[in-house]
Amino acid sequence: QGWQAFKNDATEIIPELGEYPEPPPELENNKTMNRAENGGRPPHHPFETKDVSEYSCRELHFTRYVTDGPCRSAKPVTELVCSGQCGPARLLPNAIGRGKWWRPSGPDFRCIPDRYRAQRVQLLCPGGEAPRARKVRLVASCKCKRLTRFHNQSELKDFGTEAARPQKGRKPRPRARSAKANQAELENAY
């Protein structure tokens, strides 16, 4: 029952606003950027040599045949495989104000199936056996979801959005930087 045939295309997924427990700050002031004396980014920065597409949640379209014992579908079915990594600050506009994005370790998001669809397929069997009809469950879309304390990785296909919980010592609302500075931060994250 391996993957057969080809990859058709890939679609990047943007996480939903509901995935993030904290509201975005208002973009109000123009905080100027200050460049340290020598300028430039440090060498060997984690993301500098990586293709940005490596850090996104993608829907990869695959075509395969459905099998059941010796029987095989008359036609191949196309389904999605969720692939890639999710970085909240990169993928979501205004994520800069959501959560403690400045910390060295942030929320862990995973690219997982979101919705499924049922498709009826006709299976052809060898030896003159009558064709069988089967309903198969196929991935219809993918989503970035945060791992929460209520779920582990074996349950990724089923868990919902993070339950809101009180934050210890909630910090004051940030004085956000300019939209341009914010956009620069959105290019990659965690």
Partner: antibody, heavy 119, light 110 residues
């Protein structure tokens, strides 16, 4: 060249104060969150405090809360740690470290400054 | 005692593969990304792995990280004498509101 250079360490008596400084160069200072991480002699790493681009984004380890204050001066590309009511157990090598805001991992480190608290 | 638990020591011979484990809880590794640091004798720590399994450029692909549930691990394949160092895992802890390190693992290359 990316550099973080700590200074201000030394020998101090319990209950006294000390101020550590960290001078940054070679990168866009405001793009980085900055942290103090300490290492007691022969022991492991302990995160002390961190600050985002300003005082609205600050956290402290429970062991130093109420005694230590972190701050940064973006005009001077400098990070500070004001340490009050010092205890013997604060004796350690104090590192200044940074992570680009929105990115994981402390990818820039200084060489450290030694703080000894002893009577 | 550290919030994240690592074995105090590990060893291997040149060319071998060694794995260092890091065990935490739902409030740290369970919900947040894990970073790994290497500290060579007498030097400052160096970022080795970030965001569970990503290598900064310049770090050899012999080093790899993984995470499952509330545990993480660092694997070093093709062990070399220069890999002899202390290795630390770290993650943000949502309950403590602090960045927590493991106690460190001293790796000896025999």
């Amino acid at each position: 060249e990316v550099q973080l250079v700590e200074s201000g360490g030394g020998l101090v008596q319990p209950g006294r104060s000390l101020r550590l400084s960290c001078a940054a160069s070679g990168f866009t200072f405001e793009d980085y969150a900055l942290h103090w991480v300490r290492q007691a002699p022969g022991k492991g790493l302990e995160w002390v405090s961190g600050i985002g681009w300003d005082r609205d984004f600050i956290d402290y380890a429970d062991s130093v809360k109420g005694r230590f204050t972190i701050s940064r001066d973006n005009a001077k590309n400098s990070l500070y740690l004001q340490m009050n009511s010092l205890r013997v157990e604060d004796t350690a090598l104090y590192y200044c470290a940074g992570n680009k805001i929105g990115y994981g991992g402390l990818d820039v480190w200084g060489q450290g400054t030694t703080v000894t608290v002893s009577s | 005692q550290s919030v994240l638990t690592q074995p105090p020591s590990a060893s291997g011979t040149p060319g071998q593969r060694v794995t260092i484990s890091c065990s935490g809880s739902s409030s740290n590794i369970g919900t947040n990304t894990v970073n790994w640091y290497q500290q060579l004798p007498g030097t400052a720590p160096k970022l080795l792995i970030y965001s569970n399994n990503q290598r900064p450029s310049g770090v050899p692909d012999r080093f790899s990280g993984s995470k499952s549930g509330t545990s993480a691990s660092l694997a070093i394949s093709g062990l070399q004498s220069e890999d002899e160092a202390d290795y630390y895992c770290a993650a943000w802890d949502d309950q403590l509101e602090a960045y927590v390190f493991g106690g460190g693992t001293k790796l000896t290359v025999l």
